[in-house]
């Protein structure tokens, strides 16, 4: 449903996708019960949500992961929501950290991030994690989205 | 405050209720500092939020639970946000998982779920957990809600 | 971007600030990539978000903390989102609890709170924690905000 031609609803919700890439940037797909309201928000290269209109957006991500203290580095598992704006430095908007579980073979934990941010036209948001191989891709466990206020 | 007669605000926030039922579906109540904007969203049978209008909704749930690794099954505690639409399969929208704590008698943990989804008229959302007896019902610990964009 | 003069967007996102105060109320600042849409929401005394207009608000907070079971009290780490309205008792809107980690020197964990609530003109919301000295203030780890529906 539209707010009006000049002010259409803009929202997205995308679903995690396992990836063979070694990058720490999570991959997403328009699959399952995804949302993509219109072409004013797009999923680019399966890794970032890019908006065409300036404004305030509530941006969120949820990451479920399975890790074990002995098998992982000393550092905790960190998920970061990051922003890339044309002609600007990338920046971290939100981060969450969870220490690895002692459960074997691994212990599942879920992280939720969310906040209100001003985005410029052409701005992209993406999600970084310390170890993508630990992320859980079962139905509903890991997702990423935004909505324009 | 209304957006206008044709486009009223639609929002709900309900509070967890302990239940003697053996079902894995959590029970909710309009009590304490709850929100129910109007009759375009209703709490049905104390277990599901049902919407009358099609559109994009941000739906969220928070579940706090107290569990112990030795006293619980091997499987983690999982909270699921699920959707029921007339004439459609039920489906999992979001899930979060937390491995049980080693703290005694039990260790508290909190899970937060949230995302943007298209709902059809008559659609209902509800929250499932692996063990309802572990859920914490103290003020503010466990709640469930939505808002229409 | 405004919805119109009579119905401007109201939103805020503030960033955690380390404090030498012994109070359990977290301190916030308009720094980094913060949001403060207009003077209809303000950050007062670095500790509370105060709104001028009545209405439904989605309010959220994220707190990352680092604690150790042996070095902490038996009680879990609890984060509370609280409401102060003119002429009313303070009340808890949302709470989340996480048992302390056994990791040394401390184990990081993140909590996310969020929900829809009716606020009166002059109402303030703030965040309380059991031990502010355990809160992580690195970029993006701990933040607090709201948006008016």
């Amino acid at each position: 449903m539209q707010k009006g031609d000049q002010n259409p609803q803009i929202a997205a919700h995308v679903i995690s996708e396992a990836s063979s890439k070694t990058t720490s940037v999570l991959q997403w797909a328009e699959k399952g019960y995804y949302t993509m309201s219109n072409n004013l928000v797009t999923l680019e290269n399966g890794k970032q949500l890019t908006v065409k209109r300036q404004g305030l957006y509530y941006i969120y991500a949820q990451v479920t992961f399975c890790s074990n203290r002995e098998a992982s580095s000393q550092a905790p598992f960190i998920a970061s929501l990051c922003l890339k704006s044309p002609g600007r430095f990338e920046r971290i908007l939100l981060r969450a950290a969870n220490t690895h579980s002692s459960a074997k073979p691994c212990g599942q934990q879920s992280i939720h991030l969310g906040g209100v941010f001003e985005l410029q036209p052409g701005a992209s948001v993406f999600v970084n994690v310390t170890d993508p191989s630990q992320v859980s891709h079962g139905t509903g466990f890991t997702s990423f989205g935004l909505l324009k206020l | 405050m209304q957006k206008g007669d044709q486009n009223p605000q639609i929002a709900a926030h309900v509070i967890s209720e302990a239940s003697s039922k053996t079902t894995s579906v959590l029970q909710w109540a309009e009590k304490g500092y709850y929100t129910m904007s109007n009759n375009l969203v209703t709490l049905e049978n104390g277990k599901q939020l049902t919407v009358k209008r099609q559109g994009l909704y941000y739906i969220y749930a928070q579940v706090t639970f107290c569990s112990n690794r030795e006293a619980s099954s091997q499987a983690p505690f999982i909270a699921s946000l699920c959707l029921k639409s007339p004439g459609r399969f039920e489906r999992i929208l979001l899930r979060a998982a937390n491995t049980h704590s080693s703290a005694k008698p039990c260790g508290q943990q909190s899970i937060h779920l949230g995302g943007v989804f298209e709902l059809q008229p008559g659609a209902s959302v509800f929250v499932n957990v692996t063990d309802p007896s572990q859920v914490s019902h103290g003020t503010g610990f466990t709640s469930f809600g939505l808002l229409k964009l | 971007m405004q919805k119109g003069d009579q119905n401007p967007q109201i939103a805020a996102h503030v960033i955690s600030e380390a404090s030498s105060k012994t109070t359990s109320v977290l301190q916030w600042a308009e720094k980094g990539y913060y949001t403060m849409s207009n003077n209809l929401v303000t950050l007062e005394n670095g500790k509370q978000l105060t709104v001028k207009r009545q209405g439904l608000y989605y309010i959220y907070a994220q707190v990352t903390f680092c604690s150790n079971r042996e070095a902490s009290s038996q009680a879990p780490f609890i984060a509370s989102l609280c409401l102060k309205s003119p002429g009313r008792f303070e009340r808890i809107l949302l709470r989340a609890a996480n048992t302390h980690s056994s990791a040394k020197p401390c184990g990081q964990q993140s909590i996310h709170l969020g929900g829809v609530f009716e606020l009166q003109p002059g109402a303030s919301v703030f965040v309380n924690v059991t031990d502010p000295s355990q809160v992580s203030h690195g970029t993006g780890f701990t933040s607090f905000g709201l948006l008016k529906l």
Epitope: H13, E30, K31, T35 | F89, R91 | -
Partner: nanobody, 123 residues
Framework: EVQLVESGGGLVQPGGSLRLSCAAS????????MGWFRQAPGKEREFVAV????????LYADSVKGRFTISADNSKNTAYLQMNSLKPEDTAVYYC????????????????WGQGTLVTVSS
Amino acid sequence: EVQLVESGGGLVQPGGSLRLSCAASGSGLSINAMGWFRQAPGKEREFVAVIYSSDGSTLYADSVKGRFTISADNSKNTAYLQMNSLKPEDTAVYYCAAEPYGSGSSLISEYDWGQGTLVTVSS
């Protein structure tokens, strides 16, 4: 389009068991979920159970939880519904349905349906 063929219905006494099968066929088979609905005489069609192909997640209607189990053999493109502790109120025509891939939340895709198989629970 996917063709669905159900089998396994019949007459059974209260407390008894039945196993329904649903075989899917068709070119370029691409199924997101398979499941079962049922329709009792004079009533609306209602959801019974579903299994999602991505990770085998299952969901059940409250009325059948703990009694019915849905499973799938992806190599045979077949879904099964094991029905135990059957009750007279389980009497209905059971329809298999399949949801194609690529149906986002704003795009309510049409299901493919089987012809239905009758289950009668009576002494």
